[in-house]
Interface confidence: medium
Amino acid sequence: FSPLRRISIKILVHSLFSMLIMCTILTNCIFMTMNNPPDWTKNVEYTFTGIYTFESLVKILARGFCVGEFTFLRDPWNWLDFVVIVFAYLTEFVNLGNVSALRTFRVLRALKTISVIPGLKTIVGALIQSVKKLSDVMILTVFCLSVFALIGLQLFMGNLKHKCFRNSLENNETLESIMNTLESEEDFRKYFYYLEGSKDALLCGFSTDSGQCPEGYTCVKIGRNPDYGYTSFDTFSWAFLALFRLMTQDYWENLYQQTLRAAGKTYMIFFVVVIFLGSFYLINLILAVVAMAYEEQNQ
């Protein structure tokens, strides 16, 4: 080994070197949080870039650049360092027009913390491994969601458009004339029944166990779906989104109540199956895979 390489190895393995890099990254992060940084911070930026360049040079001299098994670019963590340095010089010395977009990449410097702190490195490694292992579970999840989305599509297509429509129309009004003039939320409130504080018209259904309309209102299929049109089973994609919402239990009880009011209480069976299979089983299966990957990484 050449003397330069020997010195580089000694520096690289020294604990103070790791400490210096860690402190530099943390200080750099603090400076990045500044809203309106003063002019002198520009010089500090150059200092940080210089330290990162020095770190990479030491690593390259000690391990080699890319030829060989344990060289600098063979370690994916060093790719991050390399990208950080390249962007640092690009934003500083090359006029690329929209520099602010490139300056966003400075945030990558914060990610350098991962490669320096061993515990974080393990967690991120486990995360990457779990993503690889999750592919099968994800395929199963998407398949299950798709199957239930298709069932939902068949059972509830158009149901969430059922609304309680006012019977006592003016003599010259017709359903068509009303639908042509409905523009604002106020227009809707004039013809449909709204519960106190509700932003959507009262849902109803045509089966005996579905929601009924109050006196003076008739259940009709008209207008848009609830929640600004985002909650429905009218197409496969909307049904899939609704099923994903059930799986993640994202305000799922509202979707459950809306659907049961429009379709009938019998359909609670559908929701019980979806919640048990999707929310309890599949979510825990995903968690189990992540836990296994983390355990493997630790060993």
């Epitope: 297509m157 019977n167 299929k221």
Partner: nanobody, 124 residues
Framework: EVQLVESGGGVVQPGGSLRLSCAAS????????MRWYRQAPGKQREFVAR???????GYADSVKGRFTISRDQAKNTVYLQMNSLRPEDTALYYC??????????????????WGQGTLVTVSS
């Protein structure tokens, strides 16, 4: 497909009575309001009477006190009892209904449907 069929029209003398009926058929889930309209030769269609899902009624000023609208929910039928008929009541009488029905493919549709009309002639 939802169909509205009017019946009961005919020729009647002034001061006489007639009872028109309008029956809705098809895969009907619910009927909202039902209305009667009329169109005299060379004139525009005008509103006659209406009945809501809750059986509230409304009439045109020209027929108030003479005509009575009623409905049979079970038979999906609306009736128009016309008393003290006048020559100016001569027209083709149509019924209109807001119907929610199950259409092809099992989907549900709401819309207003019209009958073909029944002719009422009041003349001596």
């Amino acid at each position: 497909e939802v169909q509205l069929v009017e019946s009961g029209g005919g020729v009647v003398q002034p001061g006489g009575s007639l009872r028109l009926s309008c029956a809705a058929s098809g895969r009907i889930l619910r009927i909202g309001y039902m209305r009667w309209y009329r169109q005299a030769p060379g004139k525009q269609r005008e509103f006659v009477a209406r009945i809501t899902g809750g059986s509230a009624t409304g009439y045109a000023d020209s027929v108030k006190g003479r005509f009575t609208i009623s409905r049979d929910q079970a038979k999906n039928t609306v009736y128009l009892q016309m008393n003290s008929l006048r020559p100016e009541d001569t027209a083709l009488y149509y019924c209109e209904a807001l119907v929610t029905a199950s259409v092809r493919g099992g989907s549900i549709h709401s819309g207003t449907y019209w009958g073909q009309g029944t002719l009422v002639t009041v003349s001596s």
